[in-house]
Amino acid sequence: IPVIEPSVPELVVKPGATVTLRCVGNGSVEWDGPPSPHWTLYSDGSSSILSTNNATFQNTGTYRCTEPGDPLGGSAAIHLYVKDPARPWNVLAQEVVVFEDQDALLPCLLTDPVLEAGVSLVRVRGRPLMRHTNYSFSPWHGFTIHRAKFIQSQDYQCSALMGGRKVMSISIRLKVQKVIPGPPALTLVPAELVRIRGEAAQIVCSASSVDVNFDVFLQHNNTKLAIPQQSDFHNNRYQKVLTLNLDQVDFQHAGNYSCVASNVQGKHSTSMFFRVVESAYLNLSSEQNLIQEVTVGEGLNLKVMVEAYPGLQGFNWTYLGPFSDHQPEPKLANATTKDTYRHTFTLSLPRLKPSEAGRYSFLARNPGGWRALTFELTLRYPPEVSVIWTFINGSGTLLCAASGYPQPNVTWLQCSGHTDRCDEAQVLQVWDDPYPEVLSQEPFHKVTVQSLLTVETLEHNQTYECRAHNSVGSGSWAFIPISAGAHTHPPDEFLFTP
């Protein structure tokens, strides 16, 4: 640790005195203290001499000697008082800049330690300190306002009692800066804008921050716009607003608009797009396929996206048949606005019934006209199967009718024993009918097919099963002849069980 001579913590001298402060260390040493007049510095090997032959009150201060090469960073200090009867204060700063909630040191140094008992801190022109100002005093350093607040940004003077009268220091301006958490907050309104050529438009760019020192500008396609700025202060924030008013828009006004604000912490920007169109427009679309297939009993949401300007004047969902004249319940229709010019309309169809298959149309209207988007909803059904015995052209025939959607496939099975359903172990024979006859196939209805199995002799103690399946499920009908070998008997002599 360096050593200072004279080896006293404080030195009190009179104005005009010669002061010599010598610092000695193991290596080179440096003096640190407030820049002030009249000092000269001489280095002599491992010692450094700070001296003046004409000390003034301005030399009052703490002088510290450090050894730059010392890894422990040791230092020694001495405080010099230049006791001037006319100048009780040496003020080391015109201005003190701190952040809110930091301690603010106002460096009024007493030039005479004896005066410490009669010191006080005031605002300029003798005004008292603001309420709740918590401060302390050190003759070496000055007054400290603890946890300074923005509102305490004022001009202060230090007061000392000399011979019964108060002597003031020159003033110190305290600037308490708001702690700026980041770049200014930004809003750009609207987020998107569409106008027909000739209409009026307004774009508002605003920025706010706890500190007044920030810049904001609006640019169009990278060109900075010259717009008068409105400034305001509310909710403890400074606000700067730029408003672009366009009386009659044209195509050159279209494009990207960016609102940019910056301060010492950085820059924020936000953008919007302005579209100028020739005339009103109304576009309907769906992310869904317009042809929908849903299993009966399940639910479906039909969604339509609408892009429109100007806004919609009317819209509704309509059921176009073919099963009934019922209309969708309004409570099942829902509208959500994605943004100003885009909306989503949803029709919820829960637990679909057979009579609800058919065409659903969404209609919308704006000054650009009417538009419609139609969905076709077909219900899927698992196959329903029935088998009868009959004679066709004199031949005994099993006739299987299967009804469902999508169109069912038909398979015949012959198996031993009497059973409701043939299992693998019992199967004697399997016939696939790749092309069953389609009996009916109307839009939105089930498809009914018929498959024929010619049987010369109905075997006793055997079961004939017609199986039908589609993507939804399967159905079957087991035909069990009651008396054996009676192929010549009319069909009513035989029973069949579903």
Epitope: D32, P35, S36, P37, A93, V96, V97, V98
Partner: antibody, heavy 117, light 110 residues
């Protein structure tokens, strides 16, 4: 060994605020006084102001109304703000350490700031 | 207009001794110590002389400073081509309550 490094935008528009930061490395900002000096192209040096780590500042009277120097000890940095700039403020800005005898013994390499629209 | 006055230029041949003057007033040079700075082309100034006549470590003893009254001077002996630079004087000014500079002297080594 203490080193100083200036940073900030090289171009500022007239009437706007010039903001520069000086980062102190190799030593603590919490001792010594720290200064800003500028030098217009082809001209002499002009002292702008200095600051102590406690926030105490002194400014050149000719610039006082437009200058704020602040310190951030947590980042070992001090900053300069010069408001309402004009073309006459175009200069190389230096940060430097100032000693008891008002000598500038350590300098940054300087940063050129042009004021132009 | 600089507070301290320096000649705008000076020149000398290699090996020669050159002196640069700096004139002030009682509020600066008259009552405070003088510092000198060397600025090589395209670089930052460097402290050359402090407290009238003190050299920081690393500065050759060819450079010396002196002060008398309200004037100061920088002398460079055994001039070398690498001494070609701008030289600035500076001092604390009591009325300004801060440091002031001279306008600078451009030294050319012929």
């Amino acid at each position: 060994q203490v080193q100083l490094q200036e940073s900030g935008p090289g171009l500022v528009k007239p009437s706007e605020t010039l903001s520069l930061t000086c980062t102190v490395s190799g030593g603590s900002i919490s001792s010594y006084y720290w200064s800003w000096i500028r030098q217009p192209p082809g001209k002499g040096l002009e002292w702008i102001g200095y600051i102590y780590y406690s926030g105490s500042t002194n400014y050149n009277p000719s610039l006082k109304s437009r200058v704020t120097i602040s310190v951030d000890t947590s980042k070992n940095q001090f900053s300069l703000k010069l408001s309402s700039v004009t073309a006459a403020d175009t200069a190389v800005f230096y940060c430097a350490r100032i000693t008891v005898t008002s000598a500038f013994d350590i300098w940054g390499q300087g940063t050129m700031v042009t004021v132009s629209s | 207009q600089s507070v301290l006055t320096q000649p705008p230029s000076a020149s000398g041949t290699p090996g020669q001794r050159v002196t640069i003057s700096c004139s002030g007033s009682s509020s600066n040079i008259g009552s405070n110590s003088v510092n000198w700075y060397q600025q090589l082309p395209g670089t930052a100034p460097k402290l050359l002389i402090y407290s009238n006549n003190q050299r920081p470590s690393g500065v050759p003893d060819r450079f010396s400073g002196s002060k008398s009254g309200t004037s100061a001077s920088l002398a460079i002996s055994g001039l070398q081509s690498e001494d070609e630079a701008d030289y600035f004087c500076a001092a604390w000014d009591d009325s300004l309550n801060g440091p002031v500079f001279g306008g600078g002297t451009k030294l050319t080594v012929l």
